[in-house]
Interface confidence: low
Amino acid sequence: TVPPMVNVTRSEASEGNITVTCRASGFYPWNITLSWRQDGVSLSHDTQQWGDVLPDGNGTYQTWVATRICQGEEQRFTCYMEHSGNHSTHPVPS
């Protein structure tokens, strides 16, 4: 088992919103749970966008999940990752 490296980034979007993207890379096996949480609770599927789980060329995998949130609300959101029985949460950078 190779645990993922998780990286959260943010980019400006329209109307005072920002897009936050959570990327997991370098993990094996390919099974992973990656999702955005607000106030500790998973967002509904229709408010998130997922990338495919793809091989990264090193025998490991990568994927991402993104959502759009209101600027100023970043503190409320975390990226939740679960892989091979381990889990972690990752805040939005300020």
Epitope: D39, G40, V41, S42, C70, E73, Q75, R76, T78, T89
Partner: antibody, heavy 121, light 107 residues
Framework: EVQLVESGGGLVKPGGSLKLSCAAS????????MYWVRQTPEKRLEWVAT????????YYSDSVRGRFTISRDNAENTLYLQMSSLKSEDTAMYYC??????????????WGQGTSVTVSS | DIQMNQSPSSLSASLGDTITITCHAS??????LSWYQQKPGNIPKLLIY???HLHTGVPSRFSGRGSGTGFTLTISSLQPEDIATYYC?????????FGSGTKVEIK
């Protein structure tokens, strides 16, 4: 059965301090966001403060920021509200409430019986 | 801040009637609206969360609808035990804000 029991309210002079407590049972306390909400004598409900579950984020209404501090002790299953520089407009019934989590997202699914705070000289 | 405009402030209806209470948000709150019932001398209790989902143990005569900025709570076949004040709450963004309440009485 979820139970939330507040204590610590009372009569206090303007400028004084009080510490409210809320003893929680019947659920895994550390898994949920917790809230303080107050109800004014005119029966208006006002959100006061929120504290997150494990990652300790806190949020306050503008009317109490800098004067009130929300905290929690997950080992003791207890929520606190330290109130200082109290004003007459802080007079209210203070309720402790539990975040709905994944079963009732964005809602307060259980409330305590409340503890009364009166600020008067 | 998001303002929640609740109406009417009070209403009187007959037993068996269907009544509707409205909450209007000053900006888009998606479906992050909940409804609470507070009977005289009692604490608020959750009725509806996520705009339309009935909380555990709440009778099916209560229903919620809406998304975005407009939301309704409907009580069909009004019962004596429904005498209470009803509040909406937006959970989309801080500060969390309540509606001003609707007092329901029996004619």
């Amino acid at each position: 059965e979820v139970q939330l029991v507040e204590s610590g309210g009372g009569l206090v002079k303007p400028g004084g301090s009080l510490k409210l407590s809320c003893a929680a049972s019947g659920f895994t306390f550390s898994d949920y966001y917790m809230y303080w909400v107050r109800q004014t004598p005119e029966k208006r409900l006002e959100w006061v403060a929120t504290i997150s579950d494990g990652i300790t984020y806190t949020y306050y209404s503008d009317s109490v920021r800098g004067r009130f501090t929300i905290s929690r002790d997950n080992a003791e299953n207890t929520l606190y509200l330290q109130m200082s520089s109290l004003k007459s407009e802080d007079t209210a019934m203070y309720y402790c409430s539990k975040g709905g989590g994944s079963t009732a997202r964005g809602a307060l699914d259980f409330w305590g019986q409340g503890t009364s705070v009166t600020v008067s000289s | 801040d998001i303002q929640m405009n609740q109406s009417p402030s009070s209403l009187s209806a007959s037993l068996g009637d269907t009544i509707t209470i409205t909450c209007h948000a000053s900006q888009n709150i998606h479906v992050w609206l909940s409804w609470y019932q507070q009977k005289p001398g009692n604490i608020p209790k959750l009725l509806i969360y996520g705009a339309s989902h009935l909380h555990t143990g709440v009778p099916s005569r209560f229903s919620g609808r809406g998304s975005g900025t407009g939301f309704t709570l409907t009580i069909s076949s009004l019962q004596p035990e429904d005498i209470a004040t009803y509040y909406c709450l937006q959970g989309q963004s801080y500060p969390l804000t309540f509606g001003s309440g609707t007092k329901v009485e029996i004619k």
